[in-house]
């Protein structure tokens, strides 16, 4: 039994890191393999992650971690029984994929303005709480070409747009994702989408 593709890990910079790897043949990850991990820290202890299958030869492990700080470094040991298959390390702050924003809501009761709000996925004491920026994706269910991205580069988790920038009388969907420039993170997954019917009064045209 050998490792074909070494484990690569990504952290949510909060409490979970996800590691994926591939074996050289079909493997029952949960019965045959164990991923041991330990924070390099005086007060830490070794933990064991039981991997799950991710395709025939692929394995994935969800590592429960202490709250992340930038200096953290974890040792990783992949075992098959008594055989050490791979040894490595992982710095969560260098491989961050933020959590997806939640609670996306479209407020349509403001005169001719759409207000989209969502929740920051981190608690206030987490470093990423004040460092997230967002991308909001709005698209028409009727017209695949009517697809737009709004970059929200300020900290407030909200976006205001004029209802008139969208077509009236049709349904739209929106979703939001996050990233943090400070750690050069990847984008988060998209939030669940929310749907609304766009309608606004056409301005009275004088002839």
């Amino acid at each position: 039994m050998k490792v074909l593709q070494e484990p690569t890990c990504v952290s949510d910079y909060m409490s979970i890191s996800t590691c994926e790897w591939k074996m050289n043949g079909p493997t029952n990850c949960s019965t045959e393999l164990r991923l041991l991990y330990q924070l390099v820290f005086l007060l830490s202890e070794a933990h064991t992650c039981i991997p799950e299958n991710n395709g025939g030869a692929g394995c994935v492990c969800h590592l429960l971690m202490d709250d992340v700080v930038s200096a953290d470094n974890y040792t990783l040991d992949l075992w098959a029984g008594q055989q050490l298959l791979w040894k490595g390390s992982f710095k969560p702050s260098e491989h961050v994929k933020p959590r997806a924003p939640g609670n996306l809501t479209v407020h349509t009761n403001v005169s001719d303005t759409l207000l989209l709000t969502w929740s920051n996925p981190y608690p206030p004491d987490n470093y990423l709480y004040n460092h997230l920026t967002y991308a909001v994706n709005i698209w028409s269910e009727n017209d695949p070409a009517d697809f737009r991205i709004y970059n929200v580069t300020y900290l407030e988790p909200s976006l205001r747009i004029a209802a008139s920038t969208l077509k009236s009388g049709i349904s739209y969907r929106a979703r939001v994702r996050a990233w943090a420039q400070c750690y050069n993170t990847t984008w988060s997954e998209w939030s669940p989408s929310t749907k609304w019917h766009n309608s606004y009064r056409e301005p009275f045209e004088q002839h």
Partner: antibody, heavy 115, light 109 residues
Framework: EVQLVESGGGLVQPGGSLRLSCAAS????????MFWVRQAPGKGLEWVSG???????SYADSVKGRFTISRDNAKNSLYLQMNSLRAEDTAVYYC?????????WGQGTLVTVSS | EIVLTQSPGTLSLSPGERATLSCRAS???????LAWYQQKPGQAPRLLIF???SRAPGIPDRFSGSGSGTDFTLTISRLEPEDFAVYYC??????????FGQGTKVEIK
């Protein structure tokens, strides 16, 4: 908002015992290492003890064998059992959250060891 | 055990002046594990700098940290009245644990 509130300080005779408590709120207590740091009157800061999320502990040489740190994650509480107290243990005892450094501190509780 | 020595013991300066505080370690310290704190009378210490040069949340940018190996510096570019306090450096070592310097008092001249 992160809050750490110490209690249990007071006047105790040399050789006596005292148990300090620290109530934590505003963060996930179970995912953070916790510490006690003390400051003798007019002196500098001294790390006393720390406890990891899994219960691993460490102590300064000056308190080893006399002090015991513990935590109760269900109660979001940190404790310091201090036995065989000496005059030189007189200090303000701070509860702190952290790891390689201490990012949040309580306001401290004064322990006075005197006859 | 790593010993941290801070200098000077007391720094007498006027508001608006630049303050430079030194912290010297008895052996090499990882920059990732060097921090600075501010303490005012009757108050708990407050984290200013971690990782030798990263400002803690809410800390004004007049505070900056630098250095590596055995020599580290905290600089306050322009002293404000609220900056007069005692400053401590602190290091972490995987075997020896956590140690503080003896502190530098920044007082009004």
């Amino acid at each position: 908002e992160v809050q750490l509130v110490e209690s249990g300080g007071g006047l105790v005779q040399p050789g006596g015992s005292l148990r300090l408590s620290c109530a934590a709120s505003g963060f996930t207590f179970s995912r953070n290492a916790m510490f006690w740091v003390r400051q003798a009157p007019g002196k500098g800061l001294e790390w006393v003890s720390g406890i990891g999320t899994g219960g691993a502990t460490s102590y300064a040489d000056s308190v080893k064998g006399r002090f015991t740190i513990s935590r109760d994650n269900a109660k979001n509480s940190l404790y310091l059992q201090m036995n065989s107290l000496r005059a030189e243990d007189t200090a303000v005892y701070y509860c702190a959250r952290g790891r390689y450094y201490f990012d949040y501190w309580g306001q401290g509780t004064l322990v006075t060891v005197s006859s | 055990e790593i010993v941290l020595t801070q200098s000077p013991g007391t720094l007498s300066l006027s508001p608006g002046e630049r303050a430079t505080l030194s912290c010297r370690a008895s052996q090499s310290v990882s920059s990732s594990y060097l921090a600075w704190y501010q303490q005012k009378p009757g108050q708990a210490p407050r984290l200013l700098i971690f990782g030798a040069s990263s400002r803690a949340p809410g800390i004004p940018d007049r505070f900056s940290g630098s250095g590596s190996g055995t020599d580290f510096t905290l600089t306050i570019s322009r002293l404000e009245p609220e900056d007069f306090a005692v400053y401590y450096c602190q290091q972490y070592d995987h075997s020896a644990g956590w140690t503080f310097g003896q502190g530098t008092k920044v007082e009004i001249k």
